[in-house]
Amino acid sequence: QRLPRMQEDSPLGGGSSGEDDPLGEEDLPSEEDSPREEDPPGEEDLPGEEDLPGEEDLPEVKPKSEEEGSLKLEDLPTVEAPGDPQEPQNNAHRDKEGDDQSHWRYGGDPPWPRVSPACAGRFQSPVDIRPQLAAFCPALRPLELLGFQLPPLPELRLRNNGHSVQLTLPPGLEMALGPGREYRALQLHLHWGAAGRPGSEHTVEGHRFPAEIHVVHLSTAFARVDEALGRPGGLAVLAAFLEEGPEENSAYEQLLSRLEEIAEEGSETQVPGLDISALLPSDFSRYFQYEGSLTTPPCAQGVIWTVFNQTVMLSAKQLHTLSDTLWGPGDSRLQLNFRATQPLNGRVIEASFPAGVDSSPRAAEPVQLNSCLAAGD
């Protein structure tokens, strides 16, 4: 199976406006397993936001094709769920169906592995992407998205689950990583920092971006998320870095303008359908891919991560709105909801483009240490 190669979105990365800035491809020290990352306080080995503990196996699973949307794997961030954090409840995800509070939080007790043993796995997410060490895989074709341009009706559920803000997606959003690798989008959520502190989950050569969007998908080979958890390729997440740009991002504004309505943990609102693909970079051909896990408990592995090389630009005001509007449990701001980067432990990040060829003057010659492990499926 092919290791996802993550393409770094270089801090300079061009926004979805069209600039495509590859994450920096400097020749960094091997991206292997050293987590080398400054994690925000208390985010040590936190749960990945992708594994929505209480959202994945959500009780609110709906009937086929719809259930996807219901499961919100990315019950994100940083908030600590009520309940006895000490009891490692397996269902630390979310106590009940609409209740996205899991018994875990960013940075603090209980340790995630106690909440879900999988969080101590060897192939966890997020990771630091080092373009110079990524394996160029020509077989990685442009991503294909179908049905992502949603009409205003029916409206979608936007919820503050105490860990992140999550948008539940309706049936019909299809995504293909390549031939025979088809998925259905279930939900999307964001990870962010705080005033003056970046909060992306993945990093590029140690650089953390202001924020990151995750669109979680379920393989068409599975009818339910709980069946796909832990299965190689059962879940796939499209991730993109959000950066500050000079203009307001109209697509994101459709969501950000509604955050005030869900300021409280557990609150939700309905928003008109929108073009979900507009929330992602425009270049679907340049990305990094690797196999990892959900970034929040249950931290299930086997998740295929696709990280766009191009970034998405939001205005400074929009980034502030994202980090300053929502509240988590205990009168604490919902911020810094990202997990620390995890060791690669031998995994190779693949790139759909020659990311290791550094165009900057620093590198005398291209350094492409890893080779593409899987040309096909």
Epitope: E260, E261, A263, D324
Partner: antibody, heavy 119, light 107 residues
Amino acid sequence: ELVESGGGLVQPGGSLRLSCAASGFTFSSYGMSWVRQAPGKGLEWVSGISSLGSTTYYADSVKGRFTISRDNSKNTLYLQMNSLRAEDTAVYYCARTGSPGTFMHGDHWGQGTLVTVSS
Amino acid sequence: DIQMTQSPSSLSASVGDRVTITCRASQDINNYLSWYQQKPGKAPKLLIYGASNLQSGVPSRFSGSGSGTDFTLTISSLQPEDFAVYYCQQYYGRPTTFGQGTKVEIK
């Protein structure tokens, strides 16, 4: 500009409704708060409301007795005060917060209106 | 609630002096701190927000610094109109809370 009104003398247990008329900015884009200052004392946040009025917050000392509301069509903020106590005596200021939310710095303040609770 | 402690509670200074007021939070508030100036019978006026950002229209002699739990308001050269009471406010946690105030008087 923010202009408060509605203050006055009221007996313990009584009620009063304060208003804050806003002008010169897009009222519906900002969170608003009421902050009070007892004679010779410091500032105490009382209540806040988000820009669209969807979220309201109260200090424990007034919870259940005071109600904050806003009418964006009239560019006006309100504070309904019931079951007033002597310790509620203070100058009440309305303040615009620096964002649509309620817990931010107050970048514009009214001149204040005095509320005196005494028998 | 997060407690904000200002020091000193009062100080006497002369025009032209450099004045420093400190504010300490009972827990980390990142840079969610603002400073206000209040003169007798008047409403508070925002000077600094985000710990170090100068509010529009405020003289550059006012500056703020700090992050986490310790913050400072500095008036580089005290002017006659600066004699007033200064308050810090944290808006990181709920409810927002103010320091008890520091009165700057003429020596």
